[in-house]
Amino acid sequence: TPLGPKWPEPVFGRLASPGFPGEYANDQERRWTLTAPPGYRLRLYFTHFDLELSHLCEYDFVKLSSGAKVLATLCGQESTDTERAPGKDTFYSLGSSLDITFRSDYSNEKPFTGFEAFYAAEDIDECQVAPGEAPTCDHHCHNHLGGFYCSCRAGYVLHRNKRTCSALCSGQVFTQRSGELSSPEYPRPYPKLSSCTYSISLEEGFSVILDFVESFDVETHPETLCPYDFLKIQTDREEHGPFCGKTLPHRIETKSNTVTITFVTDESGDHTGWKIHYTSTAQPCPYPMAPPNGHVSPVQAKYILKDSFSIFCETGYELLQGHLPLKSFTAVCQKDGSWDRPMPACSIVDCGPPDDLPSGRVEYITGPGVTTYKAVIQYSCEETFYTMKVNDGKYVCEADGFWTSSKGEKSLPVCEPVCGLSARTTGGRIYGGQKAKPGDFPWQVLILGGTTAAGALLYDNWVLTAAHAVYEQKHDASALDIRMGTLKRLSPHYTQAWSEAVFIHEGYTHDAGFDNDIALIKLNNKVVINSNITPICLPRKEAESFMRTDDIGTASGWGLTQRGFLARNLMYVDIPIVDHQKCTAAYEKPPYPRGSVTANMLCAGLESGGKDSCRGDSGGALVFLDSETERWFVGGIVSWGSMNCGEAGQYGVYTKVINYIPWIENIISDF
């Protein structure tokens, strides 16, 4: 039998009936066997076909077969109901070989010219399958010349049979208190030849509960228990299953915190699998009862392991564990069914006894000693000598535990000394130097420290004085002996004060004139204000209207008197302000250098002389009555004058305090 070409020869060629294109002879049988390379098939088509037609092609025919299968038996010229001619059909081998047999019987009624056919090897597309046939590959099929290969979707691995995709479904660990797990692809059919292991692993103390939901469909067998595909559930205590078939298994209460679920499938079948919803339970903790004036959140029917609750107190109540305050409280349920900490109390906020107010007092408004939430207290300052600064003194115990003013301040109010009070009333006429009476000059301060000088009390812890009076002590403030509340210079009955710091105006130059002759002394303690110790007021912006030429000011001190000795008793003198040009002119002639009187000075005294301040009065206040406020204020500080106090045509020169208000305020606020 003639053989066609064999691979690796090129596989293509022509076949024809014997004698073609002439007629074929009777009793002919010819067989060709064509073989293509593996992964290839043979394609055959006819360019000419003319054979005797007979019923079922019994007489003359061309038979095409591939392996054991007959592909076609051909005769005639055109197909009929029972016979087939090739026409324009193309024929394909089923594998890599094709057998072609030509046979003619003993006679022909007329001459037939036979056939001519061409063949060639071509690649088989193994990925193309006929409808109804099983796909070549489970997931993806890839054709190539001479063959094909399969691959799998993510989450699968190719089985060793090179066609099936097994699910990569092991090693999943579920640690949440509830969740869902299912067979791969659920509710679509699960993969073949797979072995899946799922773990539920909860904290010790939890118990896992398994519920099969929706549908259950795992390949089964009528006689043998789950021989093909099965689901098993394993705990540290027992094994459940195997499960297969179409009935949802019952709930499984595992009484274990760890569960392993195994699902194994074989190579056949088309089943949708299973879905499990799991929950967990644990020993419940005692139901938390909120403390009075508090509430529990969140509210749950029961609280089990890891559940927690917080306590929130009503406004005006605070969380306390005994005496210790808590901003927040959260308790967590433990595995033994106990809470990890005890319930706190929601205690009414207690602001505690209010702080004492220096130079003031506090009164309980709500009730004696009541210091709890919404309680009201009233601060007030000691009458006459103190006044409350920017506050009405009413404080409420607020929810944050602090006494709070109506303006929202948590700091104490301030009792500021009332300034400028004097027992003395002034007249319009000039007196000679007179003895002061108690309460006339309660701001008067005696400064001892090498020399005798004076000053005036500001607020309750500052003294205003002249720079030249304390210049020597500027670096040794503690050397200053400061006395107040007395009229007699040598009296043992006085209020002692000590200096903490001395601030000399930066524009003052010692022994080079008296410009900027001003200083402040900070006391190391506040002094108690009373009728004999009261601060002088600083001038208001409008104060210059009370300090015009010829307006009367009062100077006081223990300085030299007309007898030439320091006064034993505090003396004072009422003197008029002198026109500035007049004063400047008075000190332009020798021995005074030009420019001795500056814009930072004011002058006071009589042209005729006799009324003046003198050595020892330095630093003392020249005061004026503000007729609008009816308070005394400091307009000048005793600074300098003629060598002979009270000399006619000469005047006392005073530091003009109104020019230094910003300087004074800055130092007092900074220190």
Partner: antibody, heavy 115, light 107 residues
Framework: EVQLQESGPGLVKPSQTLSLTCTVS?????????WNWIRQPPGKGLEWIGY???????SYNPSLKSRVTISVDTSKNQFSLKLSSVTAADTAVYYC????????WGQGTTVTVSS | DIQMTQSPSSLSASVGDRVTITCKAS??????VAWYQQKPGKSPKALIY???YRYSGVPSRFSGSGSGTDFTLTISSLQPEDVAEYYC?????????FGQGTKLEIK
């Protein structure tokens, strides 16, 4: 981790003011709890001085109240102790601590009151 | 002030022994009691709060009980590292007060 660290002079003269600071790391003082000062005289037991709470409120041992001030500097996450008019009886190891649900102590700082 | 009276003031026990330290409050302190362990030259370390709640990291051999005025610290099996001074403390009311201490030694 929460850490507390005391700092301040180890020697204070009688009648002066003892000042100590506790620096807290790993937790904000204003977040919660009471921040305490506790002391332990040599060879003796523990004595609570007082606390400042997360909100800035203070509570003092009545036996020391007239001399004690506890304050907080939230910007530095520190709280401080001032004890005025000290005497030899105030010589002790001073601890800062947060008590109850959170319990951490500083390592302690020895303060000697002596002239 | 609430007095916290500890007993005994010192005790000696063998490794493995069960040790009990008691603390009596001069008035009701509910369960607002803590227990501290202090080793020489070290800061106190809290063991128990709210009378019976063990701090995390504290060995389970330490336990506390009691409420009102009578409280107990128990070491179920004494270990060499438990040698220390032990203090009870009440935080029920101002001032917070400590017991005078119990010195625990190994025989």
């Amino acid at each position: 981790e929460v850490q507390l660290q005391e700092s301040g002079p180890g020697l204070v003269k009688p009648s002066q003011t003892l000042s100590l600071t506790c620096t807290v790391s790993g937790y904000s003082i204003t977040s919660d709890y009471a921040w305490n000062w506790i002391r332990q005289p040599p060879g003796k037991g523990l004595e609570w001085i007082g606390y400042i709470s997360y909100s800035g409120r203070t509570s003092y041992n009545p036996s020391l109240k007239s001399r004690v001030t506890i304050s907080v500097d939230t910007s530095k996450n520190q709280f401080s102790l001032k004890l005025s008019s000290v005497t030899a009886a105030d010589t002790a190891v001073y601890y800062c601590a947060v008590l109850y649900a959170l319990d951490y102590w500083g390592q302690g700082t020895t303060v000697t009151v002596s002239s | 002030d609430i007095q916290m009276t500890q007993s005994p003031s010192s005790l000696s026990a063998s490794v493995g022994d069960r040790v009990t330290i008691t603390c009596k409050a001069s008035q009701n302190v509910d369960t607002n009691v803590a227990w501290y362990q202090q080793k020489p030259g070290k800061s106190p370390k809290a063991l128990i709060y709210s009378a019976s709640y063990r701090y995390s990291g504290v060995p389970s051999r330490f336990s506390g009980s009691g409420s009102g005025t009578d409280f107990t610290l128990t070491i179920s099996s004494l270990q060499p590292e438990d040698v220390a001074e032990y203090y009870c403390q009440q935080y029920n009311s101002n001032p917070l007060t400590f017991g005078q201490g119990t010195k625990l030694e190994i025989k």
